[in-house]
């Protein structure tokens, strides 16, 4: 499977919420033995390979913001810990994937990450990743509500296989 | 703050099984998995298996394979590793370590030394 | 099984010094993981997907390779670095570590 970003970039004024969204694409096994592990992060352009480092989003890392669920189901987070911060992730049963962060500041600008991992049989591990901007801006240049920006058809579809 | 906190020292006679505890505290049990390491004294680090707490589901590398099991108690956040048939070269500080999935091992207990002596 | 060969066994080296360490994987890895383990005490992870800094690691440590060889470099030697250090792999079942590489003072 593959992970696509339908937006690579999202320009927000302060003060607004915005939901980030990845989508799981191609075939998804829905067997009994197989769990997904999706969660978000974020992470610099590395000269490598983007997401590669994972930082915290508003000081919760990538294992607090984490979903853990088999193929067929939907999930999403209770943890008040990252409701605390402003946040919540949640998955649908359509491969649908994104984070809503609320109450935006400049602070919150960067490039974010979200990962999926497909665990089969408890141990064979499959991991894609998918990246996106989020731009704050405050001032007369700042929009009045959240601008998002399609990804192109190659940029979409961020692989990387574990 | 994490912690993994392993049950005491053990002496077992060859033949015996051994059961070791790790309480798990300060973060959601069932979104990791549990790795047990083993290491005999003076030697380098050996993984025996791990355990899914989110589904109970078990991995365990071949050596292991029929004489570790590997358990979890969801509701005290706990988990188990019991190893049977033991003989003199199981003696080694047995770690429990914590994984976040397509990551490492980022939290270890402090270990528990089994002497397996005649 | 993916073995992992660390060279050298042991090594050397005085405080300030730059040191490197390899790990040699038998079959292609995705990414690779470095723990420090110091007498005593449980392993510390120090380096994650091959080339990030674990949480609280000096920025001294670094990791770098791809497919079969992997290295692990201290750039200027502190005292507390003195400790045996492991690379391991999450890409194929069933995981495995290296043997380790002590690093010893001069």
């Known amino acids: 499977f593959k992970v696509a970003t339908p937006y690579s970039l999202y320009v927000c004024p302060e003060g607004q919420n915005v939901t980030l969204t990845c989508r799981l694409l191609g075939p998804v096994d829905k067997g009994h033995d197989v769990t997904f592990y999706k969660t978000w992060y974020r992470s610099s352009r590395g000269e490598v390979q983007t997401c590669s480092e994972r930082r915290p989003i508003r000081n919760l890392t990538f294992q607090d913001l984490h979903l853990h669920h088999g193929g067929h189901q939907a999930a999403n987070t209770s943890h008040d810990l990252a409701q605390r911060h402003g946040l919540e992730s949640a998955s649908d049963h359509h491969g649908n994937f994104s984070i809503t962060m609320r109450n935006l500041t400049l602070l919150d600008s960067g490039l974010y990450c979200c990962l999926v991992v497909e665990i089969r049989h408890h141990h064979s591990e499959h991991r894609v990743h998918g990246a996106m901007e989020l731009q704050v801006q405050t001032g007369k240049d700042a929009p009045s509500n959240c601008v998002v920006y399609p990804s192109s058809s190659q940029d979409s579809e961020n692989i990387t296989a574990a | 703050q994490v912690q993994l906190v392993q049950s005491g020292a053990e002496v077992k006679k060859p033949g015996a099984s051994v059961k070791i505890s790790c309480k798990a505290s300060?973060?959601?049990?069932?979104?990791?998995?549990m790795n047990w390491v083993r290491q005999a004294p003076g030697q380098g680090l050996e993984w025996i298996g791990l355990?899914?707490?989110?589904?109970?589901?078990?991995s365990y590398a071949q050596k292991f394979q029929g004489r570790a099991t590997l358990t979890v108690d969801k509701s005290t956040s706990t988990a188990y590793m019991e190893l049977s048939s033991l003989r003199s070269e199981d003696t080694a500080v047995y770690y429990c370590a914590r994984r976040a999935y397509g990551y490492a091992m980022d939290y270890w207990g402090q270990g528990t030394l089994v002497t397996v002596s005649s | 099984e993916i073995v992992l060969t660390q060279s050298p066994a042991t090594m050397s080296a005085s405080p300030g010094e730059r040191v490197t360490m390899s790990c040699s994987a038998s079959?292609?890895?995705?990414?690779m993981y470095w723990y420090q383990q110091k007498p005593g005490q449980a392993p510390r992870l120090l380096i994650y997907d091959t080339s990030n800094l674990a949480s609280g690691v000096p920025a001294r440590f670094s990791g770098s390779g791809s497919g079969t060889d992997y290295t692990l470099t201290i750039s200027s030697m502190e005292p507390e670095d003195f400790a045996v250090y492991y690379c391991?792999?999450?890409?194929?079942?069933?995981?495995?570590f290296g043997q380790g590489t002590k690093l010893e003072i001069k």
């Open positions: 391991q792999q999450w890409s194929s079942y069933p995981f495995t």
């Open positions: 300060g973060f959601s049990f069932t979104g990791y998995t």
């Open positions: 355990i899914s707490p989110y589904n109970g589901g078990t």
């Open positions: 079959s292609s890895v995705s990414y």
